[in-house]
């Protein structure tokens, strides 16, 4: 079996976390957080190809079945395994609060 | 907001649970397992339209994000929730054994 | 690199007024909040309240609310602290630190100001 | 508001041992603790962050852990420029709260 880890495709071309620079303007939480006003937005990007992070036996499956029927099944797709909690000041009624959020940035990648 | 389970691009287009029928061979099972020589996969399938589904706050800043950069971000990916067990009849080095696996057929379908 | 740069050291009468000033440099001001943070002679940190540099709103020590004010001047990235009705027990080094970011870390401060308070 | 306590208030060691220090949040704060250093007569240095992750360009002999409630800061073999006050902080929700303070001093 191909290493689990191993980009067929060539380094950086398969599922694995990426930071995304974004404003709460491009995130669409102006009216709402306060600060930080930037973000660094880790998020899972990359193909799947066979053997490659496979999350679990329902990824094998979905990658045998999208070989043999590609336009019915498709590929298993690169998403978050586990996220890493972010802490956002928020206004409130009464003023600004801190809020932790538990499933905002993604920690490490998997394909499902 | 919309209605996170109408579908925008029309019936059946958006992120729900599929079946799929398959035979042991299609799943590449076919060396190690006995029964059943068939299987309904359940698997999840379809796009993930803006607010359709969205598993928790990653989804929503992967969706705005991916319409602000469409060719760096993609958009969420339609995947199990949750899944059911299964059990298959398996070979083994002294006869044979029935074995759960509890990662195999998709019971719930969400965006993420 | 980022840093923050605070005015010099006051001495002041009971029942007078301080302001000191934080000027920020080597990042986009606006993005991250400001913290203010005093420590007296020999003892310990204490959080006085924290502005967010891009709309001004705040949140204050409940023990300080209104004796203290804290603004911005975003035209020349600069953070203030206006402490008023002065008390000995004011007396402190008074610190301006950077945060909280993402991961809730307040991660630059200023080199700290000691505002002595004595008739 | 989270009471932060820290302990011991002072610990006497030589350069080269393990240093443990410990502070219990009043209630849960999730990951959200930070450690400082202060030296005399100089601001608070940020160490670690988020309970366990090292800030930029603090050397690897000091280490975070815990969650919830209990935390831990570990200097694995203390250097002659360890000795300093430390510090832990929540910021897990307003008012952001700080421990007592630990001091290291030379045995």
């Known amino acids: 079996a191909r290493n689990g880890d191993r980009c067929p495709l060539g380094p950086g071309r398969c599922c694995r976390l990426h930071t995304v620079h974004a404003s709460l303007e491009d995130l669409g939480w102006a009216d709402w957080v306060l600060s930080p006003r930037e973000v660094q937005v880790t998020m899972c990007i990359g193909a799947c190809p066979s053997q490659f992070r496979e999350a679990n036996m329902h990824a094998q499956i979905k990658m045998n079945l999208h070989r043999l029927k590609p336009d019915t099944v498709p590929a298993p797709c690169c998403v978050p395994a586990s996220y890493n909690p972010m802490v956002l000041i928020q206004k409130t009624d009464t003023g600004v609060s801190l809020q932790t959020y538990d499933d905002l940035l993604a920690k490490d990648c998997h394909c499902v | 907001a919309r209605n996170g389970d109408r579908c925008p691009l029309g019936p059946g287009r958006c992120c729900r649970l599929h079946t799929v029928h398959a035979s042991l061979e299609d799943l590449g099972w076919a060396d190690w397992v006995l029964s059943p020589r068939e299987v309904q996969v359940t698997m999840c399938i379809g796009a993930c339209p803006s607010q359709f589904r969205e598993a928790n706050m990653h989804a929503q800043i992967k969706m705005n994000l991916h319409r602000l950069k469409p060719d760096t971000v993609p958009a969420p990916c339609c995947v199990p929730a949750s899944y059911n067990p299964m059990v298959l009849i398996q070979k083994t080095d002294t006869g044979v054994s029935l074995q759960t696996y509890d990662d195999l057929l998709a019971k719930d379908c969400h965006c993420v | 690199q980022v840093q923050l740069v605070q005015s010099g050291a006051e001495v002041k009468k009971p029942g007078a007024s301080v302001k000191v000033s934080c000027k920020a440099s080597?990042?986009?001001?606006?993005?991250?909040?400001i913290n203010w943070v005093r420590q007296a002679p020999g003892q310990g940190l204490e959080w006085m309240g924290w502005?967010?540099?891009?709309?001004?709103?705040?949140n204050y020590a409940q023990k300080l609310q209104g004796r203290v004010t804290m603004t911005t001047d975003t035209s020349t990235s600069t953070a203030y602290m206006e402490l008023r009705s002065l008390r000995s027990d004011d007396t402190a080094v008074y610190y301006c630190?950077?945060?909280?970011?993402?991961?809730?870390?307040?991660?630059?401060w200023g080199q700290g100001t000691m505002v002595t308070v004595s008739s | 508001d989270i009471q932060m306590t820290q302990s011991p208030s002072s610990v006497s060691a030589s350069v080269g041992d393990r240093v443990t220090i410990t502070c219990r949040a009043s209630q849960g704060i999730s990951s959200w603790l930070a450690w400082y250093q202060q030296k005399p007569g100089k601001a608070p240095k940020l160490l670690i962050y988020a309970a366990s992750s090292l800030q930029s360009g603090v050397p690897s002999r000091f280490s975070g852990s815990g969650s919830g409630t209990d935390f831990t800061l570990t200097i694995s073999s203390l250097q002659p420029e360890d000795f300093a006050t430390y510090y832990c902080q929540q910021a897990n929700s307003f008012p952001i709260t700080f421990g007592g303070g630990t001091k290291v001093e030379i045995k």
């Open positions: 502005i967010d540099a891009y709309s001004g709103s705040t």
């Open positions: 080597g990042y986009t001001f606006t993005s991250y909040g």
């Open positions: 630190a950077r945060g909280p970011g993402q991961y809730a870390d307040v991660d630059v």
